[in-house]
């Protein structure tokens, strides 16, 4: 499965649009700092496409979801967040025909589960940060900086997964 | 491979303007904020300020506030350092150093060569 | 402002010995930083985050402490490590660094 040369600019227009959606002065938000234990190595080169599109569509599965509760609602640009959602959307449909094509039917489903759940945690994780800090604005740029940090990394393992072939 | 590349030393005179520059390479100029430290003959680190290249916010030590101006050009991934009137006090050793802002990462973890810094009547 | 207040200001020691650098914060923080500083050269990065080692930072030195108090601790000293250590909180603007603790051969 290829995934289309729009695939890469909507990945890097969400990334603008994360930019973008930034409110307050980062400065102030530095004491709430946090490790949110990004998954890297569910992320690394030694994946197979056919193991790495369940991996990524569930990355941004799990973005769309985050962003698109009511206290995401209140904490961001209503028109920059219908802009992200339609990207996200978008990626989404492209990674959904991959699987739907079978890519990855012949791989041991165990590590894709693995994969899939790691990723899961780690939203997990942020979710009950945003919760614990009362989705306060810095707790939500902190969040927004995390997963610009972590889109990137995976965009960037789409990118070397294109080179590869 | 990470780079900071700091512009040359520099010789003014007290009362003269000087902008120093600071230019990024291997990593994504944008995602990280530059510090700037000063260190005076023989003496040790002062945080001066920093800026985040996205958008150009600045915050800066309560001791350089209004004595330096902070800045960035993101199409050139360069960050300077500038004074509109420099004094013989000025006279130091300059690092820039890169932070990850907001993020879980090391804090200035690559640093400039750092310019020195000469100001002589 | 946070002050970094560090301690001793200069020691003396002699390779293979173990070292002790201490930092303590004017108040609560959760975030830091250990430097390396030789003659002529910028700043190294040597632990983060109170006691995370920075990558290819030799094993020998490690962090520890929370809240105000902060160690660093050289193992067993190599002659590569005379040079000036300084410690930095990166908990809040503005960052504030400790004064330095210079380590000489004896």
């Known amino acids: 499965c290829d995934l289309p040369q729009t695939h890469s600019l909507g990945s890097r227009r969400t990334l603008m649009l994360l930019a973008q959606m930034r409110r307050i002065s980062l400065f102030s938000c530095l004491k709430d700092r946090h490790d949110f234990g990004f998954p890297q190595e569910e992320f690394g080169n030694q994946f197979q496409k056919a193991e790495t599109i369940p991996v990524l569509h569930e990355m941004i599965q799990q973005i769309f979801n985050l962003f698109s509760t009511k206290d995401s609602s209140a904490a961001w640009d209503e028109t920059l967040l219908d802009k992200f959602y339609t990207e996200l959307y978008q990626q989404l449909n492209d990674l959904e025909a991959c699987v739907i094509q079978g890519v990855g039917v012949t791989e041991t489903p165990l590590m894709k589960e693995d994969s899939i759940l790691a990723v899961r945690k780690y939203f997990q994780r942020i979710t009950l940060y945003l919760k614990e800090k009362k989705y306060s604005p810095c707790a939500w740029e902190v969040v927004r900086a995390e997963i610009m940090r972590s889109f990137s990394l995976s965009t960037n393992l789409q990118e070397s997964l294109r080179s590869k072939e | 491979e990470v780079q900071l590349v700091q512009s040359g030393a520099e010789v003014k005179k007290p009362g003269e303007s000087l902008k120093i520059s600071c230019k990024g390479s291997?990593?994504?100029?944008?995602?990280?904020?530059i510090g700037w430290v000063r260190q005076m003959p023989g003496k040790g680190l002062e945080w001066m300020g920093i800026?985040?290249?996205?958008?150009?916010?600045?915050a800066y030590s309560p001791s350089f506030q209004g004595q330096v101006t902070i800045s960035a050009d993101k199409s050139i991934s360069t960050a300077y350092l500038q004074w509109s009137s420099l004094k013989a006090s000025d006279t130091a050793m300059y690092y820039c150093a890169r932070h990850p802002g907001l993020n879980w990462a090391p804090d200035f973890d690559y640093w400039g060569q750092g310019t020195l810094v000469t100001v002589s009547s | 402002d946070i002050q970094m207040t560090q301690s001793p200001s200069s020691l003396s020691a002699s390779v293979g010995d173990r070292v002790t650098i201490t930092c303590r914060a004017s108040?609560?923080?959760?975030?830091l930083n250990w430097y390396q500083q030789k003659p002529g050269k910028a700043p190294k990065l040597l632990i983060y985050w109170a006691s995370s080692l920075q990558s290819g930072v030799p094993s020998r030195f490690s962090g520890s402490g929370s809240g105000t108090d902060f160690t660093l601790t050289i193992s067993s000293l190599q002659p590569e490590d005379f040079a000036t250590y300084y410690c930095q909180q990166g908990y809040d603007t503005p960052f504030t660094f400790g004064q330095g603790t210079k380590v000489e051969i004896k």
């Open positions: 108040q609560s923080i959760n975030n």
């Open positions: 800026i985040d290249p996205s958008d150009s916010d600045t």
């Open positions: 291997g990593y994504s100029f944008t995602s990280y904020w």
